[in-house]
């Protein structure tokens, strides 16, 4: 189009929230969607001065096609006023956001309520337990099975017999450790499973039960209780 036009905001709804209070280590995204003819350019100021990549560790990203500024893993020194300046040869507009970085107190891990959930399956079936962990401090996660030895769930010291089924290792991602898969289930797999998450503040855990049912048409084969796990 030949209709020359100074810059204008195209989506003011996305710009209404001026104050952004964000926990440390989170990602912040500021948007200034605009139009104009010719297409305007966008630049960013921090506290009224040109915002340069070297002004913050890790720099920042500008997505021109989305009219956005993205800062990952924010720290307290990122606090301040961020102004987008959108301009072409016919004019200039600007909009300022205020960023507050909240240094949250690290807490013991929080596990999502209701997870892992009790499950049941037939012999030979597959089952999965899911555990969602929220932690400010880096958590270590384990899946534990409560087992029996010599017909007892507890040792002479009164402590339960436990078997670590899965633990976060060097090559394990958080997503991988959050799910425990049990394939080709047997009666011996029945019992209590615990998702444990710990960090430098403390440990939290949730448990769930797996019930194993006989496969259809195989009821008559079951004559004795399953062997105890060693």
């Amino acid at each position: 189009s030949n209709n020359k036009r100074a810059p204008y905001w195209t989506n003011t709804e996305k710009m209404e929230k001026r104050l952004h209070a964000v926990p440390a280590a989170n990602t912040v995204k500021f948007r200034c969607p605009a139009g104009g003819n010719p297409m305007p350019t966008m630049r960013w100021l921090k506290n009224g001065k040109e915002f340069k990549q070297e002004h913050r560790i890790g720099g920042y990203k500008v997505r021109n096609q989305h009219w956005s500024l993205i800062m990952e893993s924010v720290v307290p020194s990122d606090k301040g006023n961020y102004t987008c300046v959108v301009e072409n040869e016919y004019g200039s507009i600007n909009h300022t956001y205020h960023l507050d970085v909240v240094e949250r107190s690290p807490h013991r891990p929080i596990l999502q309520a209701g997870l892992p959930a009790n499950a049941s399956t037939v012999v030979g079936g597959d089952v999965e337990f899911v555990c969602k962990v929220y932690s400010d401090a880096q958590p270590h996660i384990q899946w534990i099975k409560h087992v029996e030895k010599n017909g007892s769930k507890y040792g002479p010291d009164g402590l339960p017999y436990l078997k670590v089924l899965k633990a976060a290792g060097v090559n394990t991602t958080d997503k991988e450790i959050e799910v425990l898969y049990i394939r080709n289930v047997t009666f011996e797999d029945a019992g209590e499973y615990t998702c444990l998450a710990g960090n430098s503040i403390g440990i939290s855990f949730h448990s769930a039960w797996l019930t194993v049912l006989p496969a259809p048409g195989r009821e008559k084969e079951i004559t004795a209780s399953p062997d105890y796990l060693e």
Epitope: S105, P106, L159
Partner: antibody, heavy 124, light 112 residues
Framework: EVQLLESGGGVVQPGRSLRLSCAAS????????MHWVRQAPGKGLEWVAV????????YYADSVKGRFTISRDNSKNTLSLQMNSLRVEDTAIYYC?????????????????WGQGTMVTVSS | DIVMTQSPDSLAVSLGERATINCKSS???????????VYWYQQKPGQPPKLLIY???NRFSGVPDRFSGSGSGTDFTLTISSLQAEDVAVYYC?????????FGGGTKVEIK
């Protein structure tokens, strides 16, 4: 027997530095977070710092942030507290305390074992 | 920070009588795992604190059953059902849910 033994305390002038150590025995040190807690003479208890089992995470009380550094050497079963720019108000008994372990626990997940403490006096 | 407020500052109780110490937190210590992370300690002169009660109401190993913990959310109580001479000490509550870990100011228990 599970034991924590602090050392390194003494009398020091304001602005100077001191390094405290805590020797752990009787448990798998490398599997536990560790804390420092202090107690000024005749006063209550104040948490100072914590370090995760592998040393990757450290947190401090605001009163010591930027001046104190917590560290550990798992090969020597030793916890340390480097105290710089000491102030008169840092005068206290410093206790080494065992924190949360890495595994399932029946009982408290830490803060069950305390050392005897080492006295730090900051005075001109 | 979570503030732990203990009361009374001191308490004089006759031998064999009940002693009750209160502790109030500025925010709930009930965690998503269903446990309430308040701990109680006993400290005698010249000694480090000794753990008495963990997770609101669980007695630590070796602690006499005259010591009990109770409460919910933000209000907690340590009770010594029948005070003995060896119970003379300062008692502290502590929150163990987030850093900075914080302690109550302490309650000094003496014999009347």
């Amino acid at each position: 027997e599970v034991q924590l033994l602090e050392s390194g305390g003494g009398v020091v002038q304001p602005g100077r530095s001191l390094r405290l150590s805590c020797a752990a025995s009787g448990f798998t040190f490398s599997s536990y977070a560790m804390h420092w807690v202090r107690q000024a003479p005749g006063k209550g208890l104040e948490w100072v710092a914590v370090i995760s089992y592998d040393g990757s995470n450290k947190y401090y009380a605001d009163s010591v942030k930027g001046r104190f550094t917590i560290s550990r050497d798992n090969s020597k079963n030793t916890l340390s507290l480097q105290m710089n720019s000491l102030r008169v108000e840092d005068t206290a008994i410093y206790y080494c305390v065992r924190g949360a372990g890495r595994g399932y626990t029946y009982g408290p997940d830490g803060f069950d074992i305390w050392g005897q403490g080492t006295m730090v006096t900051v005075s001109s | 920070d979570i503030v732990m407020t203990q009361s009374p500052d001191s308490l004089a109780v006759s031998l064999g009588e009940r002693a009750t110490i209160n502790c109030k937190s500025s925010q709930s210590l009930l965690h998503s795992d269903g446990k309430t992370y308040v701990y109680w300690y006993q400290q005698k002169p010249g000694q480090p604190p000794k753990l008495l009660i963990y997770e609101l109401s669980n007695r630590f190993s070796g602690v006499p059953d005259r010591f009990s913990g109770s409460g919910s959310g933000t209000d907690f109580t340590l009770t010594i059902s029948s005070l003995q001479a060896e119970d003379v000490a300062v008692y502290y509550c502590m929150q163990y849910i987030e850093a900075p870990l914080t302690f109550g100011g302490g309650t000094k228990v003496e014999i009347k």
